[in-house]
């Protein structure tokens, strides 16, 4: 499978809410011997690979924000912790996978990564990520609502553990 990022850039005014989205593409095994770990984190465009560094989003780590389930099941993050920080990550039956950030501030600007790990019971895993930029703007040049820019190419990584 692969991860698609429908939009590579989100430009939003301060105070607005935004939902960053990733989509799982390709065949997804729904067997009992496989589980999916999905999460979000902030990162930087590293020299070696984008999304290698996993920084917190509003003080919540990628582990705080993770969703864990089999196949294309729907799932949500723990509501109390995330919602206290104005965050919610969710996943639906169609492979869509998102994080919603409420009441954006300039500090929320940066590179965001979604990560999906397909973990199998026989000690293998397949790890894929997608990256997107969030720009939060203020002042007269800021848009009145979020403006999204489609991705021209997918920025993803595949890791298989032997």
């Amino acid at each position: 499978f692969k991860v698609a990022t429908p939009y590579s850039l989100y430009v939003c005014p301060e105070g607005q809410n935004v939902t960053l989205t990733c989509r799982l593409l390709g065949p997804v095994d729904k067997g009992h011997d496989v589980t999916f770990y999905k999460t979000w984190y902030r990162s930087s465009r590293g020299e070696v690979q984008t999304c290698s560094e996993r920084r917190p989003i509003r003080n919540l780590t990628f582990q705080d924000l993770h969703l864990h389930h089999g196949g294309h099941q729907a799932a949500n993050t723990s509501h109390d912790l995330a919602q206290r920080h104005g965050l919610e990550s969710a996943s639906d039956h169609h492979g869509n996978f998102s994080i919603t950030m409420r009441n954006l501030t300039l500090l929320d600007s940066g590179l965001y990564c979604c990560l999906v790990v397909e973990i199998r019971h026989h000690h293998s895993e397949h790890r894929v990520h997608g990256a997107m930029e969030l720009q939060v703007q203020t002042g007269k040049d800021a848009p009145s609502n979020c403006v999204v820019y489609p991705s021209s190419s997918q920025d993803s990584e595949n890791i298989t553990a032997a």
Partner: antibody, heavy 120, light 107 residues
Framework: QVQLVQSGAEVKKPGSSVKVSCKAS????????ISWVRQAPGQGLEWMGG????????NYAQKFQGRVTITADESTSTAYMELSSLRSEDTAVYYC?????????????WGQGTLVTVSS | DIQMTQSPSSLSASVGDRVTITCRAS??????LNWYQQKPGKAPKLLIY???SLQSGVPSRFSGSGSGTDFTLTISSLQPEDFATYYC?????????FGQGTKVEIK
Amino acid sequence: QVQLVQSGAEVKKPGSSVKVSCKASGGTFSSYAISWVRQAPGQGLEWMGGIIPIFGTANYAQKFQGRVTITADESTSTAYMELSSLRSEDTAVYYCARHSIGWVAELDYWGQGTLVTVSS
Amino acid sequence: DIQMTQSPSSLSASVGDRVTITCRASQSIATSLNWYQQKPGKAPKLLIYYASSLQSGVPSRFSGSGSGTDFTLTISSLQPEDFATYYCQQGAYYPLTFGQGTKVEIK
């Protein structure tokens, strides 16, 4: 904050078995791999094997295959490592450690260690 | 199994010194390389993951670099609390393997 708390020190006779426990708190237990790593006195770190609780199947280093059994109890968020046919060279501190994601990612949380002494 | 070879096995340095430890893998592991610090009687502590990413809460004087088979851990200005043993670990393949360790001692 994730914490891994291990059982206390053990003194065992050669040929016997030891079972060390590792209780996790402060995070999701089921979907994270737990590895066991040992360290003989004055020596380096040696990976013994690992398990992801939701699957229940463990993976072992060849050196310990047949002598080590790693299990996990999801209901109590506890992982166990049992080592049989003990010999004096098994005297070591045994650590449990949690992987950040999946089977092979970095070990980001560690237990405090359990000293197992094998002596006649 | 992938062999991890660290050098030097020990070194003496003074507070403020720049210290470099290297780790070589017997085959390519891309950037699946982690560094740990261990103090006597304590569990190891993760410093660097993915070869160059700093674990949360670790001081920025620690940095990692490399890919493939050759990796480096650098402490830009050694502090008193940095005297410890450092281990590299490959996270690309089972079995997971560690370097033999580098002991950083006070000169």
